[in-house]
Interface confidence: low
């Protein structure tokens, strides 16, 4: 069937359109184009005779039409009036007629639109604004954009007048945005320039910064006020209701307590006519005095007295702080703070509580410190120590003993020999001693402030013959590869040589053996089981010598990796299984067995009579030395075969 296609269907003014013919019949005489929906000679545009290839214009020909041999019609420089139907009349060779109709529509190219507004300065929460998209254009669609986004859904936004008018009811500051309108028709779309809505608002309740309301005398007060407002607000300051100045910032240097009061910022918007105020209460504090510490006891006695330290002066609504040894207070049941933190009580003072102590008064963001205070704690005397530590002396030498006891105030000393007072000095000196000077030497220390006394007694032996020495040890049961042992030869004697023997031999050279303290002390580092020997010490001087009884070192070791015997791992069914486990250990270890991971008996020997293949599996021996805290184990696989199935198997025990 003959059809006409318009390309394009919607045509912009000034452009061109092609009326394209489809299914044109064969053997044509000619064809003719008409404006309208029927063949009307008065509205003929152009005719064409194929034989002569002659095109003949008709009454409706405008000079803008071109006809092609395939009967298609091109119309150029389209005008609005070209809109409508076009009919093709085809005359075939047999003079039979055929017709087809097509159509297109013409639209203008739209101009760039613009936005008009009925209110250039609307007031927030009061005014409405109507934007209108200009010009009014027929057959055009109107669209709106806010900040380049399509219109949000809002009950305050309303479109009217064919969407040409956008109304914003009760405008808010959030409506301050870029607005654009767009016109569209089938052949063009144009957007306006943006219009910025200038919403007048505020002032909101102003905010005063900084938020700080507390100041010290002598500081500068610098307050700033800000209120959201369009146009920007005009500011005024009032102090205690009295007008000060019309500025956004209020500056008062070197304030005093008299500057305390209520500070009001008033914000005014000349366009909206609105005022808003905010009040802040400023408190100016006088510089507090430097604090100092008072004590209820200037000379407390250790372990007897309590001391209460008080931070002066007393100021209401003040935070008091304490430091000991330049640190904040440690957590201690002996330290107690009063409810207001002003008094620090030390219960049952010790010599370590001397301090220094400081207290502080917190004033806003700074703290004023007192001078440090040191406690004079009376203590002691402790048990006095007598030096040197020698107890044996040879006749003819000088005896010089010194006594010392920790004490505050320093102790007063007295010496007694065999209970008889000798002298009130810290040192005792006797020249050219004899055997008669042997005896009990007592040092007595006395603290006059606390009234306490302590004594120490030392036995001094004056003899040409040295006593039989003995060995003391710092560890009677050392653990192998872990502990060290220090043997000391007693007593300590003046002008004496100390000697050592191990198993009757002189000391071997070893980096693990070390002599110290004038050879009086023998230290064995990282002891081993081989160190379990007899140790003897000897002392000698120019006139005598003596040896100690031997001391045998008991080294704890093991358990070593155990050995299971016999070594056989294959048995015949019906044999007895008798496994024995042994591990080197001191003291002897505890033994236990597991078969296939299941605990068995706690014995050194595991016996199973008449074993079968069911007794196949892993046999583990576990050893444990409670003294060393160490454990060890070994696993052995046992295979039991049916009788006679495998030559060379053990028959068992």
């Amino acid at each position: 069937k003959l059809t006409i296609e318009s390309t394009p269907f919607n045509v912009a003014e000034g452009k061109e359109v092609l009326l394209l013919v489809h299914n044109l019949p064969q053997h044509l005489f000619g064809y003719s184009w008409y404006k309208g929906e029927r063949v009307d000679g008065n509205r003929q545009i152009i005719g064409y005779v194929i034989g002569t290839q002659q095109a003949t214009p008709g009454p409706a020909y405008s000079g803008r039409e071109i006809i092609y041999p395939n009967a298609s019609l091109l119309i150029q420089n389209i005008i609005q009036n070209d809109t409508g139907f076009y009919t093709l009349h085809v005359i075939k060779s047999d003079l039979v007629n055929e017709e087809a109709t097509g159509q297109f529509r013409v639209y203008p190219e739209l101009p760039k639109p613009s936005i008009s507004s009925n209110n250039s300065k609307p007031v927030e929460d009061k005014d409405a604004v109507a934007f209108t998209c200009e010009p009014e254009t027929q057959d055009a669609t109107y669209l709106w954009w806010v900040n380049n986004q399509s219109l949000p859904v809002s009950p305050r936004l309303q479109l009217s007048n064919g969407n040409r008018t956008l109304t914003l009811f009760n405008v808010t500051r959030n409506d301050t945005a870029s607005y654009k309108c767009e016109t569209q028709n089938p052949v063009s779309a144009r957007r306006s320039d943006s219009v910025i809505l200038n919403v007048l608002y505020g002032p909101d309740a102003p905010t005063i910064s900084p938020l700080n309301t507390s100041y010290r005398s002598g500081e500068n007060l610098n307050l700033s006020c800000h209120a959201a407002s369009n146009p920007p607000a005009q500011y005024s300051w009032f102090v205690n209701g009295t007008f000060q100045q019309s500025t956004q910032e209020l500056f008062i240097p070197n304030i005093t307590v008299n500057n305390s009061g209520s500070y009001t910022c008033q914000a005014h918007n000349s366009d909206t006519g609105l005022n808003r105020t905010t009040v802040t209460t400023i408190t100016v504090y006088a510089e507090p005095p430097k604090p100092f510490i008072t004590s209820n006891n200037s000379n407390p006695v250790e372990d007897e007295d309590a001391v209460a330290l008080t931070c002066e002066p007393e100021i209401q609504n003040t935070t008091y702080l304490w430091w000991v040894n330049n640190q904040s207070l440690p957590v201690s049941p002996r330290l107690q703070l009063s409810n207001d933190n002003r008094t620090l009580t030390l219960l049952s003072v010790t010599r370590n509580d001397v301090g220094p102590y400081e207290c502080g008064i917190q004033n806003e963001l700074s703290v004023d410190h007192s001078d440090p205070v040191i406690l004079n704690v009376l203590y002691g005397p402790d048990d006095p120590t007598i030096s040197p530590s020698y107890t044996y002396y040879r006749p003819g030498v000088n005896l010089s003993l010194s006594c010392h006891a920790a004490s505050n105030p320093p102790a007063q000393y007295s010496w007694l020999i065999d209970g008889n007072i000798q002298q009130h000095t810290q040192e005792l000196f006797i020249s050219n001693i004899t055997e008669k000077n042997s005896g009990l030497y007592t040092c007595q220390a006395n603290n006059s402030a606390s009234g306490h006394s302590r004594t120490t007694v030392k036995t001094i032996t004056v003899s040409a013959e040295l006593p039989k020495p003995s060995i003391s040890s710092n560890n009677s049961k050392p653990v192998e590869d872990k502990d060290a042992v220090a043997f000391t030869c007693e007593p300590e004697a003046q002008n004496t040589t100390y000697l050592w023997w191990v198993n009757g031999q002189s000391l071997p050279v070893s980096p693990r053996l070390q002599l110290s303290n004038g050879n009086r002390t023998l230290t064995l580092f990282n002891v081993t089981r081989n160190d379990a020997r007899a140790y003897v010490c000897g002392i000698q001087n120019s006139v005598s010598a003596n040896r100690s009884d031997p001391v045998t070192l008991d080294v704890l070791y093991g358990p070593d990796t155990p050995i299971i015997s016999p070594p056989d791992s294959s048995y015949l069914s019906g044999a007895n299984l008798n496994l024995s486990c042994h591990s080197a250990s001191n003291p002897s270890p505890q033994y236990s067995w597991r078969i296939n991971g299941i605990p068995q008996q706690h014995t050194q020997v595991l016996f199973i009579a008449k074993i079968t293949p069911n007794n196949n599996g892993t046999y583990a021996c576990f050893v444990s030395n409670l003294a060393t805290g160490r454990n060890n184990s070994i696993v052995k696989s046992i295979t039991v075969s049916a009788s006679g199935t495998s030559p060379g198997l053990s028959a068992g025990a």
Partner: antibody, heavy 121, light 108 residues
């Protein structure tokens, strides 16, 4: 020593109400402004409200204004946050916090242990 | 409102190294009114620095603060194992009080 012990958190439906308490000890209560700060799970810290030492001035974040009321009972050394018209976005751990200095607002040297408020249907 | 932007969001550092954390304000903050806090999981925040550079009571001197205007910095000179946490900056110059969203300092 300063202690802030909180109570009153829990699960509440949207639109419901809840009251948080914060008992203070170890300092002169009336000398210090106090605040509530909250932290939604895995989120930032958000200041909620502040109250002056005497209780005559209160401040609120916009997100809670008109729904939350911050008060204090200085005779009991206790703070209260009354939360009404609760929303899912109010779900958070709420901390009460003590200000560092006299009449200083917004600088927190001691905090409560926090209490979880969950708003869910 | 004053917005505080902290960077980086996460900082991976080895113990003993130096850590530098940044806090930027959307408008000028008086340096007297900027603070830093440390928060560990399941705990309340702990005040480290106030007034941009003053250490709070009991805070070790490896923590230091600096900056003015809109740019502030927290520096941890030598990170100890207990310093791995989230650090927040906060302004207390204007209502509303605002916090940054934190920098997490994690073990590298």
């Amino acid at each position: 020593q300063v202690q802030l012990v909180q109570s009153g958190g829990g699960l509440v439906q949207p639109g419901g109400s809840l009251r948080l308490s914060c008992a203070a000890s170890g300092f002169t209560f009336t000398s210090y402004a106090m605040s509530w700060v909250r932290q939604a799970p895995g989120k930032c810290l958000e200041w909620v409200s502040a109250i002056s030492g005497t209780g005559d001035s209160t401040f609120y974040a916009d997100s809670v204004k008109g729904r939350f009321t911050f008060s204090r009972d200085n005779s009991k050394n206790t703070l209260y946050l009354q939360m009404n018209s609760l929303r899912a976005e109010d779900t958070a751990v709420y901390y009460c916090a003590k200000d560092l200095g006299w009449l200083q607002y917004g600088l927190f040297d001691y905090w409560g242990q926090g209490t979880l408020v969950t708003v869910s249907s | 409102d004053i917005q505080l932007t902290q960077s980086p969001a996460t900082l991976s550092v080895s113990p003993g190294e130096r850590a530098t954390l940044s806090c930027r304000a959307s408008q000028s903050v008086s340096s007297s009114y900027l603070a830093w806090y440390q928060q560990k999981p399941g705990q309340a925040p702990r005040l480290l620095i106030y007034g941009a550079s003053s250490r709070a009571t009991g805070i070790p001197d490896r923590f230091s603060g600096s900056g003015s205007g809109t740019d502030f910095t927290l520096t941890i000179s030598r990170l100890e194992p207990e310093d791995f946490a989230v650090y927040y900056c906060q302004q207390y110059n204007n209502w509303p009080l605002t916090f940054g969203c934190g920098t997490k300092v994690e073990i590298k």
